[in-house]
């Protein structure tokens, strides 16, 4: 939430947003440890699957959306649920799986329709002309990856990493999420601990690029493991 994210002193002075480690699998971003990032974990098996609590769709994986697990259930308890396939019922775009969007309460293929009005403007303004603008797009509905074909360039507003061009990931920045560069060798990254330690903070970093992993920098001058920098290094 804005309250926890933006008012936290711990996150106001993070290192510059360089991009980062293999983080939250759904959004492909890495966050500084310490502040919980409740998101979908689609890499878990059914056997050990634990539902991730969420507040908004952006906190879930690419193939998930945020909602109450039971119809008419406790509105205060929301978890990441599997997205809905084509021809399934929906209430908003994020409920539909990538490649689809919600039209008249049904998930339909993005390819079958040329978007009109606000959504069409969203695509053109934010991504088609490389002019990301407030007018015409909205954070939780019209910016879903299923709704446009042109990928966002660095600095474009996004909802998920699939919204961004190659070499970029979708990462949180203040009250928004924008396409940021995937990390190169030697750049600082954030190594997550175990499940549940994904941080929700102002500067999320991307994962390390192909052939790289986020590892402790070999530095003999560092005294404690906890204070050591993690950088993207060759496997």
């Amino acid at each position: 939430t804005l309250n926890s994210v933006l008012n936290s002193n711990a996150i106001k002075n993070l290192p510059p947003p360089l991009g980062g480690a293999a983080g939250h699998p759904g959004s492909a971003v890495s966050a500084a440890p310490g502040i919980l990032y409740p998101g979908g974990n689609k890499y878990q098996t059914i056997d050990n699957y634990q539902p991730y609590p969420c507040a908004e769709d952006e906190e879930c994986g690419t193939d998930e959306y945020c909602a109450s697990p039971t119809r008419g259930g406790d509105a205060g308890v929301q978890i990441c649920l599997a997205c809905r396939k084509r021809r399934k019922r929906c209430m908003r775009h994020a409920m539909c799986c990538p490649g689809n969007y919600c039209k008249n309460g049904i998930c339909v293929s993005s390819d079958q329709n040329h978007f009109r009005g606000e959504i069409e403007e969203t695509i053109t303004e934010s991504f088609g002309n490389d002019h990301s603008t407030l007018d015409g797009y909205s954070r939780r509905t019209t910016l879903s990856s299923k709704m446009y074909h042109t990928k966002g360039q660095e600095g474009s507003v996004c909802l998920r990493s699939s919204d961004c061009a190659s070499g970029l990931c979708c990462a949180r920045h203040f009250w928004s999420k924008i396409c940021k560069p995937v990390l190169k060798e030697g750049q600082v990254c954030t190594k997550h601990r175990r499940k549940g330690s994904h941080g929700l903070e102002i500067f999320q970093r991307c994962y390390c690029g192909e052939g790289l992993s986020c590892r402790i920098q070999k530095d003999h001058h560092q005294a404690s493991n906890s204070s050591r920098l993690h950088t993207c290094q060759r496997h």
Epitope: K12, P17, R139
Partner: antibody
């Protein structure tokens, strides 16, 4: 078209309370964060704080925290900035700005607040 | 807070001139820099975001460059309607902060 219409100019005395408004149209109010920015006469712009109208979450610049309150009314698609006790130093132009990215793309026309005894 | 310092504080140029304004951040802000134009009695207008990306509807004579701590805003060919005060803004670290402004006048 995104439009932000701010309330009229106000003339107040120190110690009085005040609430100024920013009525939005042309977009879904809960889909954008709303910011307030202060500009004192002939000075730079200062970010005061932000509200997420979808859930009421707020964040403030430490400089203004505790002195102003940012709120939003979903039913009227209106954001508010209020003071419980004005100071002479609060005299300034106040702008609301609605955005999704880390920039301020749409602005209200501004509300001039005059505080004098 | 990150301090943003603009220079010059004011400048006078002729129509058709190339105009350059600089903005220096007190610490590295990567590409997280925006530029705004404010005309007297009006609200600011976003011109450039993320250092160099032109906002929708903004003429191509406006451009931005730089990285880290030093940034430049350029008007390639000054037009009469460009008379305004220009502000830079960092959005790297909370709170977002603005430069003190550069007032541009026509000779």
């Amino acid at each position: 078209e995104v439009q932000l219409l701010q309330s009229a100019a106000e003339v107040k005395r120190p110690g009085e309370s005040l609430r100024i408004s920013c009525k939005t149209s042309g977009y879904t109010f809960t889909e954008y964060t709303m910011h307030w920015v202060r500009q004192m006469p002939g000075k730079e712009l200062e970010w005061m704080g932000v509200i997420d109208p979808s859930n009421g979450d707020t964040s403030y610049n430490q400089k203004f925290k505790g002195h102003v309150t940012i709120s939003a009314d979903k039913s009227s698609s209106t954001a508010y900035l209020q003071w419980s006790s004005l100071k002479a130093s609060d005299a300034a132009m106040y702008y609301c700005s609605s955005t999704t990215g880390p920039w301020f793309a749409s602005w209200g026309q501004g509300t001039l607040v005059t505080v004098s005894s | 807070d990150i301090q943003m310092t603009q220079s010059p504080s004011s400048l006078s140029a002729s129509v058709g001139d190339r105009v350059t304004i600089t903005c220096r951040a007190s610490q590295d802000i990567s590409n997280y820099l925006n530029w705004y134009q404010q005309k007297p009695g009006k609200a600011p207008k976003l011109l450039i975001y993320y250092k160099s990306r032109l906002h929708s509807g903004v003429p191509s004579r406006f451009s931005g460059s730089g990285s880290g701590t030093d940034f430049t805003f350029t008007i390639s060919s000054l037009q009469p309607e460009d008379i305004a005060t220009y502000f830079c803004q960092q959005v790297h670290t909370l709170p977002p902060t603005f430069g003190q402004g550069t007032k541009l006048e026509i000779k």
